[in-house]
């Protein structure tokens, strides 16, 4: 049987034409399911904001190796978390929309806290 | 739905060049990055190399670093890897992929080169 | 270049059993590794990326682990359809590398 048929499905349709500044970020999902129109990354805020980016773009590329670095140091594998942290605000200067499809993304937290957890992308339906 | 189909085998002599397709379906190549990964008879996978279609930029292997060239044209959703200098040891199928993160979700169904003289 | 160890480059094993193969890198990847599965005359197929992130329609007996330069995959249960070889690959930096791959074969 397939895995976890009713798991969600972000996808990106624009991306963001600002630099977030780094310190901002706490995490980020890689986008690559064919039922998106492109392969995108969306990163997650400390304040629980989405925010689609170019993953072809040289400041994406090196943000997201600095996060995984720092997910490392702290986190020595990928957990999951509620829904209700992705569900809390809108995405920032992009359209993003969420379907239902299996494992649509993996997102990876790079936050230090103890409590702190890997999330996945999240049915809002 | 996302297709790659590729260009039909090949039979080429030891130093000649051979250039294989792969044409996209079901998404637009400049969105991703088109790679080439091969795999000679009864062995692992070889990443080749990338192409950005959108801009052209591309990376290599550097062991493959001036014998091969990808390209793309994107009015046909196409890229293309050209190999040169034609050794026996080139014998694989060749495989174009899609994946902006470095790895494959996406693959063509193989060519089949065999060189020989 | 980043080198991937993967053991063991083949095994026998039954319907049911349990499988599990090894990855190593030579430095750390930070979890961007991917596993595939080829069956003969066919393209590679992604199961795994992430090192744990199943792909859609792969079925939940599969399942990857690991970080720094160690990774696994495991096949909880196997079925007639998982004879196959599997390779994993790191994604961290170019050139992208593949393990030797594993054959599972019937025992």
């Known amino acids: 049987q397939p895995d976890a048929v009713n798991a969600p499905l972000t996808c990106c349709y624009s991306f963001t034409s600002k630099m977030i500044p780094m310190s901002r970020l706490e995490s980020y999902k890689r986008i690559t399911s064919s039922r998106c129109p492109k392969e995108a990354v969306v990163f997650v805020t400390k304040l629980k904001r989405e925010v689609c980016a170019d993953p072809k773009k040289e400041w994406v590329q090196t943000y997201i190796k600095n996060l995984d670095r720092n997910q490392m140091r702290s986190e020595p594998t990928t957990l999951f978390k509620t829904a209700s942290a992705l569900r809390s605000s809108a995405p920032l200067n992009v359209k993003l929309t969420r379907k239902s499809e299996a494992n649509a993304s993996t997102t990876f937290s790079t936050t230090t806290s103890s409590t702190s957890v890997g999330v996945t992308s999240v049915t809002v339906n | 739905q996302v297709q790659l189909v590729q260009s039909g085998a090949e039979v080429k002599k030891p130093g000649s060049s051979v250039k294989v397709s792969c044409k996209a379906s079901g998404l637009t190549i400049s969105d991703t990055y088109m790679h080439w990964v091969r795999q000679a008879p009864g062995q692992g996978l070889e990443w080749m190399g990338r192409i950005d279609p959108a801009n052209g930029n591309t990376k290599f292997d550097p062991k493959f670093q001036g014998r091969v060239t990808i390209t793309a044209d994107t009015s046909t959703s196409t890229a293309y890897m050209e190999l040169s200098s034609l050794r026996s040891e080139d014998t694989a199928v060749y495989y174009c992929a899609r994946g902006v993160f470095g790895f494959f979700d996406y693959w063509g169904q193989g060519t089949t080169v065999t060189v020989s003289s | 270049d980043i080198q991937m160890t993967q053991s063991p480059s083949s095994l026998s094993a039954s319907v049911g059993d349990r499988v599990t193969i090894t990855c190593k890198a030579t430095?750390?990847?930070?979890?961007?590794l991917a596993w595939y599965q080829q069956k003969p005359g066919k393209a590679p197929k992604l199961l795994i990326s992430g090192a744990t992130s199943l792909e859609t329609g792969v079925p939940s007996r599969f399942s990857g682990s690991g970080s720094g330069t160690d990774y696994t995959l495991t096949i909880s249960s196997l079925q007639p359809e998982d004879f196959a070889t599997y390779y994993c690959?790191?994604?961290?930096?170019?050139?992208?590398?593949f393990g030797g791959g594993t054959k599972v074969e019937i025992k």
């Open positions: 430095e750390d990847i930070y979890n961007r």
């Open positions: 690959q790191q994604f961290w930096s170019a050139p992208y590398t």
